[in-house]
Amino acid sequence: MMTGTIETTGNISAEKGGSIILQCHLSSTTAQVTQVNWEQQDQLLAICNADLGWHIYPAFKDRVAPGPGLGLTLQSLTVNDTGEYFCIYHTYPDGTYTGRIFLEVLESSVAEHGARFQIP
């Protein structure tokens, strides 16, 4: 029985050229997190595996940084980074939990007035 819930940073905006932290948090379960995937709909960005550590998709290595924690930091943002990001928590014994974040990358002057969310 999957009792857990995923909390995410929800819809976030950031400015072009800046950076953003994508973060999810699994709560209400004692299940052990064995792997977390960060993905877009058509490709994987990063994997944090309990045994193997972090793997970053090669094309993103120079502007994606692991962490903080199980989160992911995107740097040198471009308008093309706008879109959906998924965190997939592989857990034992519960199974898989998925969270969704929508990132909008804006021109600097617009982004300054946009809402930003971050899970403490």
Partner: antibody
Framework: QVQLQESGPGLVKPSETLSLTCAVS?????????WNWIRQPPGKGLEWIGY???????SYNPSLRSRVTISRDTSKNQFFLKLSSVTAADTAVYYC???????????WGQGTLVTVSS | DIQMTQSPSSLSASVGDRVTITCKAS??????VAWYQQKPGKAPKLLIY???YRYTGVPSRFSGSGSGTDFTFTISSLQPEDIATYYC?????????FGQGTKVEIK
């Protein structure tokens, strides 16, 4: 329970356009996931054709991109495959499938055989 | 495109035997590999995702392992109902690609 069901002509003439429908029941195609087409020539392996996501964005296999269009009718909870300029090499069982990020293709239709022949 | 090469292409084993299939990716795909079972005339069924995680309802005799470019799928004790063709698939990036399949038969 999610169910996917392919339908369409079983025979298509060379150079014509293959058109298939995938009817989804038990889940709204606008709620989540990527809705895919995958094919399997007789006695051969599986080839991913492309998808339309719940938000309407599409992604195609580069090997077929110039001939493929995937679209949807949200009111009927259906999505469609069109493959133009078909040849005998396009003869295959065509499957629709639901993909979940991080997992793979967890739900499949039963498949429909399309033969390209004059 | 990422090529997935499976071996062997077919095998014959006795009921109760341990069966192992390997899959090699043409580049590092971390743990983004799934395994499917396809019986004749039927659609494939997802068995394993992310290299080693059993999908809901899949019997414990099916397991997967590996990371990077080398992956293994194992049936710990072959049952008559396991006669099928098994495919690996990378879910690392599009175009998503499959191995050519391994046909498992009973001796």
């Amino acid at each position: 329970q999610v169910q996917l069901q392919e339908s369409g002509p079983g025979l298509v003439k060379p150079s014509e356009t293959l058109s298939l429908t995938c009817a989804v029941s038990g889940y709204s195609i606008t709620s989540d996931y990527a809705w895919n087409w995958i094919r399997q020539p007789p006695g051969k392996g599986l080839e991913w054709i492309g998808y339309i996501s719940y938000s309407g964005s599409t992604s195609y296999n580069p090997s077929l991109r110039s001939r493929v269009t995937i679209s949807r009718d949200t009111s009927k909870n259906q999505f469609f495959l069109k493959l133009s300029s078909v040849t005998a090499a396009d003869t295959a069982v065509y499957y629709c499938a639901r993909r979940q990020v991080g997992l793979g293709f967890a739900y499949w239709g039963q498949g429909t055989l399309v033969t390209v022949s004059s | 495109d990422i090529q997935m090469t499976q071996s062997p292409s077919s095998l014959s084993a006795s009921v109760g035997d341990r069966v192992t299939i390997t899959c090699k990716a043409s580049q590092d795909v971390s743990t983004a590999v799934a395994w499917y079972q396809q019986k004749p005339g039927k659609a494939p069924k997802l068995l394993i995702y992310s290299a080693s995680y059993r999908y809901t309802g899949v019997p414990s005799r099916f397991s997967g392992s590996g990371s990077g470019t080398d992956f293994t799928f194992t049936i710990s004790s072959l049952q008559p109902e396991d006669i099928a063709t098994y495919y690996c698939q990378q879910h690392y990036s599009t175009p998503w690609t499959f191995g050519q399949g391994t046909k498992v038969e009973i001796k």
